[in-house]
Structures are given as structure tokens and as C-alpha cells.
């Protein structure tokens, strides 16, 4: 038994036929010693007398609000809730399994940007006697603050004969660092109480993995002379992180009729305009995705082909515009070849995802995982890799990136990747290894050697352990190179002389 909140207690029960249940001792919160009686819920039947009451809790009939009285006066209440464990598994009766992205997904969370603000939602078919409370933190062993609001009913849907209720909650990390590479996941815990049943649900994620941008805004069409094509332009959504030269998006532009089975024109671009073939009764749609990290695509923003939008065929806000930043040399050190670094780091992002695309859909946060990921270097908040830090002095950040590149290059050349099951030198991992080396050499200033971090002694003995470790390292590398790519894209747009 444990206290959920003041005067509310959860009794954990192994739930099977003829289970002995749990013995619970309730104590009346009063200085009185004599003449105390106990009742359950609205019943006037006296269950016992004395300052304490011992009960055997086996089923829901034994749960409820226990009240101690003296004379006609109520002294205190204790509400007992039951948390069922069947075959070693805690019950999940209150919430509906959303089955996306995998089975046993009860909580789903999304973030519109990297500000540390996110929304979680869940589904239930229960309409009454239902309460939720939400807690969140970053990391679990030394948790950092995340503040969540109250869960509210956000939607009602009819599914066949049943009504389905969607609840949602908004949370905000107290000290968010949008430009940093997350090393500890956000933990979300939802307590659900239906009548006398208690259940808890948890979710663990990095903000980068739940990013889903809002759709692009302000779609405009401009017909092109002597062509069947139109130029479509758009702008970054207002809710996306800024500056866009650092937090860049990539876009998919599609022309399609009302039916998904109809023919279409489709093109991908990093710019905020594209030329496509429009036709009568079709629509042009544009959606966005983080350019350097393969999280979710936004919903589509659409405009009909007929009546070509407004006449302003402007090119939008420019995906890599650097705001009003003047070009300037990097103080405190030689300037890197920003554009070359940008191209190579973007290639690294592509390679990191093609090295094992499934890595993005595997849940690798298991026991012992924090040891693995804490062994690798992360680009942290104080490393100067945010836009302001880069403008002040990019050397700190570049040194950190260089250390990370060398570290991962050594890791990809180690027994973890060279041992069984073997990988060929020109596999995506082989190409990744070579590109890490290439970028680190571009960064290393002449006659200047930055200190490098020691490679950890991770030597798995079994091939399956090696495989799991590879996945974890690649997953971590995907996050690292995404931050590096943002740094170089921003540098190329705003710092390059």
C-alpha cells in the first residue's frame, strides 16, 4: 500500500482466483483514543472500532472510502484504490491501446518545435468517474523539472457503437535548451483512476523523436508563362523553432486529385518554393519535416489548382535565410569551410539514417541503456552550439563537434562494428565511418590538435549484444550529427565570410 495523495491510498493486488489479497491497517487521523467506529462508503454498518482498523483487501468490494467517526462526528477518511496485477503485469483497463507506433502504446506525445513544450494524449471509452493526474521530468535518477497542466477532455468520437474520449495535457520543460542534443529522455507518468481502480501509464521519449511541425503556411501559386506548371511558394509555420537557418525544414510538395488513387506530381525540396504540374480539380499540398532528423512529417497544407491562389508568387521566407546577421569571421580561431562542412554534415545525416533506418522505429531504451548513451559525447547546453553561442565564438562548439566526430569515428572502426555479424567496408556504416573522418579533418585547424575523448571499453561478447549496441550507437549518432548539421547550416548562412 502507498499514498497517492492525502488520504488516498493504492493497494497493489495480485489478481487471480482465491488470491489471499493484502492486509491493510488503517489509522484514524485523530488524537482521540476511545469510542471510534469505522464505516465504508455510504453504509452505516460498523466494520470495527478503535483507532486502527485491520482489513483484508481482496476485491473491489473491499476498496472505497473508509471513514472513522466518534459519536456523530466524522474524524477522518481514507480512500482505498486497487491496482491490479495479473500474471505479473499491471492492468491497463482504463486507457485504450492506440497501437501506434507499436502495440501497448497508451500515451502519445508530440512537439511542434524544440522549445521543450509538448502535448500528450490518450483515449478511453469511459465517460464518468474518471480522473487523471500527470507528472513529468527529464531523466529519472536525477530528474530535471517539467511542468504539466491539468488533463482535459479534448475530443469525443463515435467508433461503431462506442463513444471514444480523448484527453490531452500540455507540458513544458522548465529549463529547455532547444539547440542541445538531448541525452536524457523526458519521462511522462499518468495516474488514472476510474471509480476504485487505479492504473498508471508511462512514456519515455526524446523531444527530437516526437517532433511534428505544423503545416507550412501562406501557400501561394503563380502560373508560369508558356508552361503547364505553376510555382508554389510557402513559409515556415509560425510555431517552428527559430532561426530557420539553424532549425531548418525540408518539404514535400504534391499535386493530387481528390482520390489517393489518382495520378500525382511529387517533389521534395529544402527551399520554400517549387515548380509543379497543376491540373483541373487537383490540389497542391505541402508538408514539412525536420531537415536533419527523421521525425514525423507535418499534416498537409493545401490549395486548389484552379484559381491560382493570390497573385503574389513570392518565394516565402527562405528556408536558410539568416535573418539580419552580417557575415563575419569567427573570433578566437580560424573559420572553418562552413559550406563544405554543411554539405558533408548533411550527407552524414542521410548516411546515419540509411545505416539503419529501422533504428528510428526500435525502442532501445532498456535497462543499462543510460550507461551506453552516457558514454558517448553529447553536444550540451553550455557548448556554445546554439545560434547565439556560434555568433559569440564558434570555436567552443567546433571543438565539441570535432571531439564527437573523432569519438564516433573510432567507435565505428572498433570491434563493435568490425566484429561479427560483419559489415562490408562500402556499407552505409563504412561510408559513415569515412565521412566522419572527412568532416573531422575539415574541422581540425592546421598545427592545432584538440584533445579527444577516450573511447569507452564497450566490448560485447555475443553477436546479438554487438547488434544491439550498434543500434544504440547509431541512434545516438543520428542525434549528434543532426545538431552538427544545424550548426554548419547556420554557419554557412550567417558566419561564412
Amino acid at each position: 500500500i502507498w499514498e497517492l495523495k492525502k488520504d488516498v491510498y493504492v493497494v497493489e493486488l495480485d489478481w487471480y482466483p482465491d488470491a489471499p489479497g493484502e492486509m491493510v491497517v488503517l489509522t484514524c487521523d485523530t488524537p482521540e483514543e476511545d469510542g471510534i467506529t469505522w464505516t465504508l462508503d455510504q453504509s452505516s454498518e460498523v466494520l470495527g472500532s478503535g483507532k486502527t482498523l485491520t482489513i483484508q483487501v481482496k476485491e473491489f468490494g473491499d476498496a472505497g472510502q473508509y471513514t472513522c467517526h466518534k459519536g456523530g462526528e466524522v474524524l477522518s477518511h481514507s480512500l482505498l484504490l486497487l491496482h491490479k496485477k495479473e500474471d505479473g503485469i499491471w492492468s491497463t483497463d482504463i486507457l485504450k491501446d492506440q497501437k501506434e507506433p507499436k502495440n501497448k502504446t497508451f500515451l502519445r506525445c508530440e512537439a511542434k518545435n524544440y522549445s521543450g513544450r509538448f502535448t500528450c494524449w490518450w483515449l478511453t471509452t469511459i465517460s464518468t468517474d474518471l480522473t487523471f493526474s500527470v507528472k513529468s521530468s527529464r531523466g529519472s535518477s536525477d530528474p530535471q523539472g517539467v511542468t504539466c497542466g491539468a488533463a482535459t477532455l479534448s475530443a469525443e468520437r463515435v467508433r461503431g457503437d462506442n463513444k471514444e474520449y480523448e484527453y490531452s495535457v500540455e507540458c513544458q520543460e522548465d529549463s529547455a535548451c532547444p539547440a542541445a542534443e538531448e541525452s536524457l529522455p523526458i519521462e511522462v507518468m499518468v495516474d488514472a483512476v476510474h471509480k476504485l481502480k487505479y492504473e498508471n501509464y508511462t512514456s519515455s521519449f526524446f523531444i527530437r523523436d516526437i517532433i511534428k511541425p505544423d503545416p507550412p503556411k501562406n501557400l501561394q501559386l503563380k502560373p508560369l508563362k508558356n508552361s503547364r506548371q505553376v510555382e508554389v511558394s510557402w513559409e515556415y509555420p509560425d510555431t517552428w523553432s527559430t532561426p530557420h537557418s539553424y532549425f531548418s525544414l525540408t518539404f514535400c510538395v504534391q499535386v493530387q486529385g481528390k482520390s489517393k488513387r489518382e495520378k500525382k506530381d511529387r517533389v521534395f525540396t529544402d527551399k520554400t518554393s517549387a515548380t509543379v504540374a497543376c491540373r483541373k480539380n487537383a490540389s497542391i499540398s505541402v508538408r514539412a519535416q525536420d531537415r536533419y532528423y527523421s521525425s514525423s512529417w507535418s499534416e498537409w497544407a493545401s490549395v486548389p489548382c484552379s484559381g491560382s491562389g493570390s497573385s503574389r508568387g513570392g518565394s516565402g521566407s527562405g528556408g536558410s535565410g539568416g535573418g539580419g546577421s552580417k557575415l563575419r569571421a569567427v573570433p578566437g580561431g580560424s573559420s572553418p569551410a562552413w559550406t563544405q562542412c554543411q554539405q558533408l554534415s548533411q550527407k552524414l545525416c542521410t548516411l546515419a539514417w540509411s545505416a539503419h533506418p529501422l533504428v528510428g522505429h526500435m525502442d532501445l531504451r532498456e535497462e543499462g541503456d543510460e550507461e551506453t548513451t552516457n558514454d558517448v559525447p553529447h553536444i550540451q547546453c553550455g557548448d556554445g552550439c546554439d545560434p547565439q553561442g556560434l555568433r559569440d565564438n564558434s570555436q567552443f562548439c567546433l571543438q565539441r563537434i570535432h571531439q564527437g566526430l573523432i569519438f564516433y569515428e573510432k567507435l565505428l572502426g572498433s570491434d563493435i562494428f568490425t566484429g561479427e555479424p560483419s559489415l562490408l567496408p562500402d556499407s552505409p556504416v563504412g561510408q559513415l565511418h569515412a565521412s566522419l573522418l572527412g568532416l573531422s579533418q575539415l574541422l581540425q585547424p592546421e598545427g592545432h590538435h584538440w584533445e579527444t575523448q577516450q573511447i569507452p571499453s564497450l566490448s560485447p561478447s555475443q553477436p546479438w549484444q554487438r547488434l544491439l549496441l550498434r543500434f544504440k550507437i547509431l541512434r545516438s549518432l543520428q542525434a549528434f550529427v543532426a545538431v552538427a548539421a544545424r550548426v554548419f547550416a547556420h554557419g554557412a548562412a550567417t558566419l561564412s565570410p
Epitope: 489518382e262 517533389v267 525540396t269 529544402d270 515548380t275 491540373r279 483541373k280
Partner: antibody
Framework: QVQLVQSGAEVKKPGASVKVSCKAS????????LHWVRQAPGQGLEWMGW????????EYAPKFQGRVTMTTDTSTSTAYMELRSLRSDDTAVYYC???????????WGQGTMVTVSS | EIVMTQSPATLSVSPGERATLSCRAS??????LHWYQQKPGQAPRLLIY???QSISGIPARFSGSGSGTEFTLTISSLQSEDFAVYYC?????????FGGGTKVEIK
Amino acid sequence: QVQLVQSGAEVKKPGASVKVSCKASGYTFTDYYLHWVRQAPGQGLEWMGWIDPENGDTEYAPKFQGRVTMTTDTSTSTAYMELRSLRSDDTAVYYCNANKELRYFDVWGQGTMVTVSS
Amino acid sequence: EIVMTQSPATLSVSPGERATLSCRASQSISINLHWYQQKPGQAPRLLIYFASQSISGIPARFSGSGSGTEFTLTISSLQSEDFAVYYCQQSNSFPLTFGGGTKVEIK
């Protein structure tokens, strides 16, 4: 299944025109874009243009603009590509191809060899 | 127009070995890149679309990667039926253009 059958080989004199046909079957003709791509002997592939059989919209590669005409006959599910003012370097295999996506080529015809020789 | 350059022009590989073919665009084309296989006397066949998307019916040994200006087609273990000419094609902008091709021949 989706199939494209092209007309037979042609031999033409320089300055003449050629009209190659491409008969589609196994799908609703107006549901796919149709492209023409050519390949000179021992050479690579060269895109010529596309037509939307639903409305007759066309887009030609600048190299062929003014010299090529692509048309369709929806009643017979046939596409045509006419190339005028033939030169010897127009000697090639001409392929028609169809796809629901405009910008790449899924289903190909067997090709029609056009020889331009005096 | 966008110029596509493939390398090497000819690649000699033994059956069972891995083949890596490269394609470079003269400007950034995001992932608007497709790969085809052509055998002598036959029409080309689509292998990969949008840089890395696989086609049903195409063996899993064919995979594509890349974005921007550099792309790779990998054949993990060459079978006898894979000896052919491979072309890349960009769809970023019209006119659509192809690379010059890479001939994969038996070593």
C-alpha cells in the same frame, strides 16, 4: 497488368517525320501520365516530354520544343509521338512509359527503333 | 538543366560481391533521384525511387541512399542476372535528366 505495346520499327529519310504509337492496356488510360524517352545506339537515356491523357496537357524538353508533338486517343487508349525534321542523330530506340507519378518511369513499352538515313 | 554524372562508367565485379554505384547531381536535388536497370535489348526497369524507396518485386539486395548532390546504389551480393547498365535520373526539375550510366560487368 499494365502493359504498353509500341508500333514497329521505322526507317526515315532526313527531313521527314515519324509518328510512333503506344497502345496501353490493363488500366484506365487517363489515370497515368505518359512519357517518351529515347536512347541512341550505345548511348544513354534522354527524356523527351510527357502528356496527360486526361486533358491533353504536355510538357516537352527544351531540346525537342517545336519539333515534337505528343497526342493521345482515349477511345483507343493509344498515345502518339510525332518527331519532325528528322536528322541522322535522331536514330534511336523510342520508348513510351506510363506512371501514376509524373516524374519517374514505372512501366515501359518494348521500344520502337527509328532509323534516319539517306 | 541539371547534369547527372555517374561513376564509374564500368564496374567489374565477381558474382556474390557487393557493388556500389555513384551518381552526382550538378546542383542539390534533395531526394528527387531514381535508379533504373537496363539489360541488353530490353527496356529499362525501375529499381529505386526517391533515393531510397524500394519497389515491390525488386530484390532486397538493391538499396539506395543519399540526398542533395551525392547518391549511391548498392547491390549487396551480385547475382548473374544483375550484370547490366544502371542509370540514375533526377526529378527535381524539368527537363528530367539521366546520368550516363554505369555498366556492371563480370570480373
